[in-house]
């Protein structure tokens, strides 16, 4: 037997356990942490990836100014509750019964409360702004080449439909990628912008989630594009609800 052929792996998610125990003995992969079956032909949801991560051993000014309602993920890692489809549950709580509401990318959008806190619906993040600063290079990248390369990356590596990459802005050394996807625009089978952004973030950090693929080697006309810092802003369809205390802090 050829060992490599006679086993199961998940090309799009290395944080899985796979075996030929699906229907008809087909390969079936389950996410670590949750044990949920994942579709290896597309990206795994961010919620299941976070759960798996927690279970693992440990020209003119064109740049966009994030809206006052933009959220940044300051809370870092947590062990999320995911619904049967692998999406974040609207309400998340920790082991000490502290609860908060999250958006569709799992970022907190309310003050923390107790078990009585209600989160009526999972609010969709419809606009993601990925703000990158690249390492110094001999000269600036050509904007249209950079635009084309980043769009290609999101289309080919993350399988995100090109219509969801709204814009690529560049003002050396800052690059901004805007992803937009309303609830009405997202068809069945479409990759979610939140999942694509998370895979991209992990790639940029050198922590690729893809099985056996090399790390991300971003090049613009042969010139390496090396990112030295990343900031991601999340805009929800409904503005977040934080107390004034947080806003003035």
């Amino acid at each position: 037997h050829t060992a490599a052929q006679d086993n199961c792996t998940c090309p799009t998610n290395k944080m899985t356990v796979c075996s030929p125990d699906g229907p008809g003995g087909r390969c079936q992969c389950r996410a670590l942490g949750s044990g949920m079956a994942v579709d290896c032909s597309t990206l795994t949801s961010k919620c299941l990836l976070l759960k798996a991560r927690m279970s693992a051993p440990k020209n003119a000014r064109t740049l966009v100014r994030p809206s006052e309602h933009a959220l940044v993920d300051n809370d870092g890692l947590y062990d999320p509750d995911c619904d049967p489809e692998g999406r974040f549950k609207a309400r998340q709580c920790n082991q000490t019964s502290v609860c908060w509401c999250v958006n569709s990318v799992g970022v907190r959008r309310t003050d923390k409360g107790d078990l009585s806190l209600r989160c009526d619906e999972l609010v969709r993040t419809h606009h993601i702004l990925i703000d990158l600063r690249h390492r110094p290079t001999a000269g600036a990248f050509n904007h249209s080449d950079l635009d084309a390369e980043l769009r290609r990356l999101f289309r080919e590596r993350y399988r995100l439909h090109p219509k969801f990459v709204a814009a690529v802005h560049y003002e050396q050394p800052t690059i901004q990628i805007e992803l937009r996807q309303n609830t009405s625009q997202k068809a069945a089978g479409d990759v979610d912008i939140g999942d694509a952004a998370y895979y991209f973030e992990r790639d940029i950090k050198g922590e690729s989630l893809f099985q056996g693929r090399g790390g991300l080697d971003l090049r613009v006309r042969g010139e390496p594009l090396q990112v030295e810092r990343t900031l991601i802003y999340y805009l929800d369809e409904i503005p977040p609800k934080f107390s004034m205390k947080r806003l003035t802090a």
Epitope: P20, P23, S41
Partner: antibody
């Protein structure tokens, strides 16, 4: 050694119901995907139902709604519940243990649907 | 449904001689997970089917190495280097890439 023994096949009238059993041994039943495959009198093979390790069930459209695959982990038995039987359901029914396909087959149990 | 077309319907072979059976599918059997869920089975007279080959070319345990499976996409072949008496019976191909899973109609291998 993997052993699969089917039983429950009888002569049944059209519209009737039947429950087939498959006693499994020689492997970890709870970790395995299992299926039922039938062979018509013309010797044509047809996939009938599958159950994955996570107990998700799968059926071809031709039997959906009339056939249910299930299992009893305590007794290591795979079942096939058949209702609203038709003459075209007449076949030898085989239970299989699955790994990249139908890896192991039982000896089969004969179901005849006739008035 | 994916149609699996086997040829020939009957194959008459002299013991010790090679034999080859073809199976063509109506659609590529390469799955999105990179695997090709294609099997060859043999049903000897009066017996249950027994799998010989899985994932196109992998031999099941206990299957003699005179059997070889090859192919990709839509075209697959089973070759027997030297036919022996125990190889007689009906050979079926199967696909598990697309739902519903489907079988070929069979190729009967008989002695000339």
């Amino acid at each position: 050694e993997v052993k699969l023994v089917e039983s429950g096949g009888v002569l049944v009238k059209p519209g009737g119901s039947l429950k087939l059993s498959c006693a499994a041994s020689g492997f970890t039943f709870s970790d395995s995907a299992m299926s039922w495959v039938r062979q018509t009198p013309e010797k044509r093979l047809e996939w009938v139902a599958s159950i994955s390790r996570g107990d998700d069930t799968y059926y071809p459209d031709s039997v959906k709604g009339r056939i249910t695959i299930s299992r009893d982990f305590a007794r290591n038995i795979l079942y096939l519940q058949m209702t609203s039987l038709r003459s075209e359901d007449t076949a030898m029914y085989y239970c299989t243990r699955d790994r990249f396909g139908f890896a192991y087959w039982g000896q089969g149990t004969l179901v005849t649907v006739s008035a | 449904d994916i149609v699996m077309t086997q040829s020939p319907l009957t194959l008459s072979v002299t013991i010790g001689q090679p034999a080859s059976i073809s199976c063509k599918s109506g659609q590529s059997l390469l799955d999105s997970d990179g695997k090709t869920y294609f099997n060859w089975l043999l049903q000897r007279p009066g017996q249950s089917p027994k799998r010989l080959i899985y994932l196109v070319s992998m031999l099941d345990s206990g299957v003699p190495d005179r059997f070889t499976g090859s192919g990709s996409g839509t075209d697959f072949t089973l070759k027997i280097s030297r036919v022996e008496t125990e190889d007689l019976g009906v050979y079926y191909c199967w696909q598990g890439t697309h739902f519903p899973f489907t079988f070929g109609s069979g190729t009967k291998l008989e002695i000339k």
